[in-house]
């Protein structure tokens, strides 16, 4: 069906298919070291890996993309791993008046998907 | 800073960055022949294009995807093309009791952006 | 693994000082803020203020302002907290707690405590 | 400041349990808030942060959910170690206040 549940077994062997990786940064890999004061050194977990056909799919658009990658790879690229929901964080900022707590939304991903 | 504007001229040159096409694909390249009536041919628009550095960027997330990619390339990948909307279409569908109206609201992409 | 080993208990008279460390290993010092907690007998939590090793910027609890002072020498991974004019109501359980590597306002892991009494 | 009042103070509960704790901010704090356990004579520890994110090595047995001003933190089955007072923590603004904690207390 169009609304097949997404596969999760990857057919390219362990670690190869889109998932969740930590990634170290630091603020100024970031270039944000001007105004983000701490912590200096981000656990940043980041979404990496290949998405053979219909593994993870993210919706309708995304199956019919792997479909039509099969039958037209010149034309149409392959579903790509990208976040499906994230983790917000706080870091603390450099303000005029000190220090401030700052929200990120969307910094840190939280899960992975084929889209 | 962190929250910068996305780039949105492409570096590339025309037709290079992500961006919305227009792919033709029939019910059969779908898969979907057995159970949508119509229409038999689809107009679907999908996102294709390169994401160069912070072009069209989604978010905070993807900016930092774009900024470690440059310094660690093996490690973590580009942002890659993806839609950030939907337009929803209603296809004809045969049912046991005759043909119903399905609507589809992630089916077809309405507009584009690096994740 | 990333530990943090404070100073033993201290037994102090009102009106006096006192300076609790708190020496980290296992991580980068000067990559994660330290925060400070106590706890009274039998209480809950309260938190202090927080100072980022990296360099030296401050945030303290408003009631204790004026009080404490947190440092922190980096060449030997070490944060200090020291509090002034000793009160009956300071005797607590004194925590260094590191920022989460997730999020600056989660705090984790911590130090085992130091006990600060303060009596006449 | 943000006060946190969290509820019940204590519970009574057996092995197997499942256990549902309360934390209420008294302004929106978005998702910004964090779980501690403490064990008597013991540091807390980070069970939670973000309201939902499981802290590495803690128990899946353990969740959290919320937004705003209310918040959660279940155990699913509780187990002879989780024993222990739990106290959740605004982290969306200085100075960080915490909730004045629950016993869980075997029955």
């Known amino acids: 069906s169009a609304h097949a549940h997404p596969r999760d077994s990857c057919p390219l062997g362990p670690g190869r298919c889109c998932h969740l990786e930590t990634v170290q940064a630091t603020l100024e890999d970031l270039g944000w070291s001007d105004w983000v004061l701490s912590p200096r050194q981000l656990q940043l977990s980041m979404c990496v890996g290949e998405c053979p056909h219909l593994y993870r799919s993210a919706n309708t658009h995304a199956q019919i993309k792997a479909r039509l990658h099969g039958l037209q790879p010149d034309k149409v690229p392959a579903p790509c791993c990208v976040p499906s929901s994230y983790t917000p964080v706080v870091l603390m900022h450099r303000t005029d008046s000190g220090v401030s707590l700052q929200t990120y939304d969307d910094l840190v991903a939280r899960g992975c998907h084929c889209a | 800073s962190a929250h910068a504007h996305p780039r949105d001229s492409c570096p590339l040159g025309p037709g290079r960055c992500c961006h919305l096409e227009t792919v033709q694909a029939t019910l059969e390249d779908l898969g979907w022949s057995d159970w949508v009536l119509s229409p038999r041919q689809l107009q679907l628009s999908m996102c294709v294009g390169e994401c160069p550095h912070l072009y069209r960027s989604a978010n905070t997330h993807a900016q930092i995807k774009a900024r470690l990619h440059g310094l660690q390339p093996d490690k973590v990948p580009a942002p890659c093309c993806v839609p950030s909307s939907y337009t929803p279409v209603v296809l004809m569908h045969r049912t046991d009791s005759g043909v119903s109206l399905q609507t589809y609201d992630d089916l077809v992409a309405r507009g584009c952006h690096c994740a | 693994q990333v530990q943090l080993v404070q100073s033993g208990a201290e037994v102090k008279k009102p009106g006096a000082t006192v300076k609790v460390s708190c020496k980290a290993s296992?991580?980068?010092?000067?990559?994660?803020?330290i925060h400070w907690v106590r706890q009274a007998p039998g209480q809950g939590l309260e938190w202090m203020g927080w100072i980022t090793a990296y360099s030296g910027d401050t945030v303290y609890a408003q009631k204790l302002q004026g009080r404490v002072t947190m440092t922190t020498d980096t060449s030997t991974s070490t944060a200090y907290m020291e509090l002034r004019s000793l009160r009956s109501d300071d005797t607590a359980v004194y925590y260094c707690a590191r920022e989460s590597g997730q999020t600056s306002s989660a705090l984790g892991p911590w130090g085992q405590g130091t006990l600060v009494t303060v009596s006449s | 400041d943000i006060q946190m009042t969290q509820s019940p103070s204590s519970v009574s509960a057996s092995v197997g349990d499942r256990v549902t704790i309360t934390c209420r901010a008294s302004?929106?704090?978005?998702?910004?808030l964090a779980w501690y356990q403490q064990k008597p004579g013991k540091a807390p520890k980070l069970l939670i942060y973000?309201?939902?994110s499981l802290q590495s090595g803690v128990p899946s047995r353990f969740s959290g959910s919320g937004s705003g001003t209310d918040f959660t933190l279940t155990i699913s089955s509780l187990q002879p170690e989780d024993f222990a007072t739990y106290y959740c923590q605004q982290g969306a603004s200085f100075p960080l206040t915490f909730g004045g904690g629950t016993k869980v207390e075997i029955k």
């Open positions: 296992g991580y980068t010092f000067d990559s994660y803020g």
């Open positions: 302004q929106g704090i978005s998702r910004w």
């Open positions: 973000a309201a939902s």
